[in-house]
């Protein structure tokens, strides 16, 4: 469960974070867990243990392997594995599969490609940057902090892109590189009025007395990002919040998907402990945006539990 | 969101045990430690000790190391805590709590509505 | 053991008063949560690693301090806020709270 797989090419900086977080101040041990050997702290060591991170300075072949890290709370001994594997360098151009990190989307309004696990790093700017392993060059790429800005993207810039920097530790310099790919989402997008795919109009929802029920108001409004867009419901015309029935909530966050290219929203209302009363009330589900809004009611009826005869 | 749910109130004799629990809901019940914490009438809190429910590993107050068994059922997602030799000072409300972020013990955000333990002849 | 000191144990203020409450460590802590508990009721977090504010907690409460002294600061007494306010400490075992504060409307 509190296990992390990370990687790195021979000869390179590697730094791990163990997955089992804990404060600054918990002490930290780290070791192999083949050998149950302990991980040094003292830095003159090639592979040795900082707290919560593990660094290969640089990185072998032969550092593969799992380790184990313990986190020492006042109360407990937290333990976490980090599956390293080093690889070693490839002489032609491609990155292979097992070597890329999360892939990334971009389009025309959004071009950001953050380098991945530089926070790990103490590292100084600018970052290279290289596309197919040629180094990026021309007014439209800019290095920024630890991401490449593209302006003007076109659907030729996807591909897989390389950061490539230097860690410094105690004076001396490792070299670091990290590749991921990037697409390129087409943004040729609209707004439309909200057009409501749950619930139907007028629906009745079955519920039974005493169990817990959902109720999912799902919307669209149109394709690519929206400037503003909501669902919301409302009982007997009053917004969840104010109703002031602890029983039912709203779900935290509305969950954005995208249906066929479309920008969707939906909003679970969570009813817990069905009452009677709660058969009463009206349920609407709310969807606007700038074109305006769309409702559609919903009530509830009692579920007749099925009569079982022998 | 976030549920624990004890057992309800017990009235024992002197010498007896006692075995409360807590049922979890809302979370994966092994991701976060349970603590136990009790409060004697019109008195303070006072940490009894916890479990984590992933591995059955213990951490007790050392007051009441020999007396307290905590276990937790994952099957069920219930934690328990059993006190045995009870005494008269051992009546309070005992409360199952557990951690918002359990690695960095940011406190103890989540509580059981307590169990009512008298411990009476 | 780590003792936890809280003063006063009791105090009485009007609405709108800024109070303060001080819990004192016998020994050296690195982070103070605080929670307040009301009749009947069980704890409720409202500041966590000594300044933080738990989630859904109004803004008027706060935390302060480090070593062996921190402080918890209600700016403006609301009626609500009548209960009893405890200080605890997660650095060592046992984990241990304060004795309490117990908070009064004059």
């Known amino acids: 469960k509190f296990s992390k797989q990370s990687w790195g090419l021979e000869n390179e900086a590697l730094i791990v974070r163990c997955p089992r977080q804990g404060k600054p101040s918990y002490t930290v041990d780290w070791y192999y867990s083949q050998t149950n050997k302990s991980i040094p702290t003292q830095e003159r060591n090639r592979v040795f243990a900082s707290g919560q991170l593990l660094k290969f300075l640089p990185a072998a072949v032969a550092d593969s392997g799992i380790y184990t890290c313990i986190v020492r709370s006042p109360t407990f001994n937290r333990t976490g594995y980090a599956n390293v594997t080093i690889y070693k360098k490839q002489s032609d151009c491609n990155v292979p599969d097992y070597l890329m990190y999360s892939t990334v989307s971009g389009s025309e309004k959004n071009s950001k490609i953050y380098c991945p696990t530089i926070d790990l790093y103490n590292w100084t700017a600018p970052l290279e940057w290289f596309k197919n392993c040629q180094a990026l060059q021309g007014s439209r790429y800019r290095a920024h902090k630890s991401f490449l800005v593209i302006d003007n993207v076109m659907t030729e810039d996807a591909g897989d892109y390389t950061c490539k920097f230097i860690h410094n530790e105690n004076g001396a310099n490792y070299s670091v590189t990290a590749t991921r790919s990037f697409t390129v989402k087409d943004e040729q997008g609209f707004s439309l009025f909200p057009v409501i795919g749950a619930p139907a109009q007028n629906e009745i929802k079955e519920v039974e007395i005493g169990k817990n029920a959902n109720l999912t108001c799902s919307a669209c409004f149109g394709k690519g990002t929206q400037f503003l867009a909501a669902v919301l419901w409302q009982l007997n015309g009053t917004k969840i919040t104010d109703f002031g029935e602890p029983r039912i909530q709203q779900e935290e966050g509305q969950n954005q998907s995208f249906s066929n290219g479309l920008a969707c929203l939906d909003m679970v209302l969570r009813i817990a402990d069905v009452k009677e009363e709660d058969l009463l009330l009206q349920y609407d589900c709310l969807a606007l945006n700038l074109h305006g809004l769309r409702r559609h009611t919903v009530r509830l009826s009692r579920k007749n539990p099925i009569d079982h005869h022998s | 969101q976030v549920q624990l749910v004890q057992s309800g109130a017990e009235v024992k004799k002197p010498g007896a045990s006692v075995k409360v629990s807590c049922k979890a809901s809302?979370?994966?019940?092994?991701?976060?430690?349970m603590y136990w914490v009790r409060q004697a009438p019109g008195q303070g809190l006072e940490w009894m000790g916890a479990i984590d429910p992933e591995t059955g590993d213990t951490a007790f107050n050392q007051k009441f190391k020999g007396r307290v068994t905590m276990t937790a059922d994952k099957s069920t997602s219930t934690a328990y805590m059993e006190l045995s030799s009870l005494r008269s000072e051992d009546t309070a409300v005992y409360y199952c709590?557990?951690?918002?972020?359990?690695?960095?013990?940011?406190?103890?955000?989540?509580w059981g509505q307590g169990t009512m333990v008298t411990v009476s002849s | 053991d780590i003792q936890m000191t809280q003063s006063p144990s009791s105090l009485s203020a009007s609405v709108g008063d800024r109070v303060t409450i001080t819990c004192s460590a016998s020994s050296s802590v690195n982070y103070m949560h605080w929670y307040q508990q009301k009749p009947g009721k069980a704890p409720k977090l409202l500041i966590y690693d000594t300044s933080k504010l738990a989630s859904g907690v109004p803004s008027r409460f706060s935390g302060s301090g480090s070593g062996t002294d921190f402080t918890f600061t209600i700016s403006s007494l609301q009626p609500e806020d009548i209960a009893t306010y405890y200080c605890?400490?997660?650095?060592?075992?046992?984990?241990?709270f304060g004795q309490g504060t117990k908070l009064e409307i004059k």
């Open positions: 809302g979370y994966t019940f092994t991701d976060s430690e």
């Open positions: 709590t557990r951690a918002f972020d359990n690695d960095n013990d940011e406190g103890f955000a989540y």
């Open positions: 605890q400490q997660w650095s060592s075992n046992p984990l241990t």
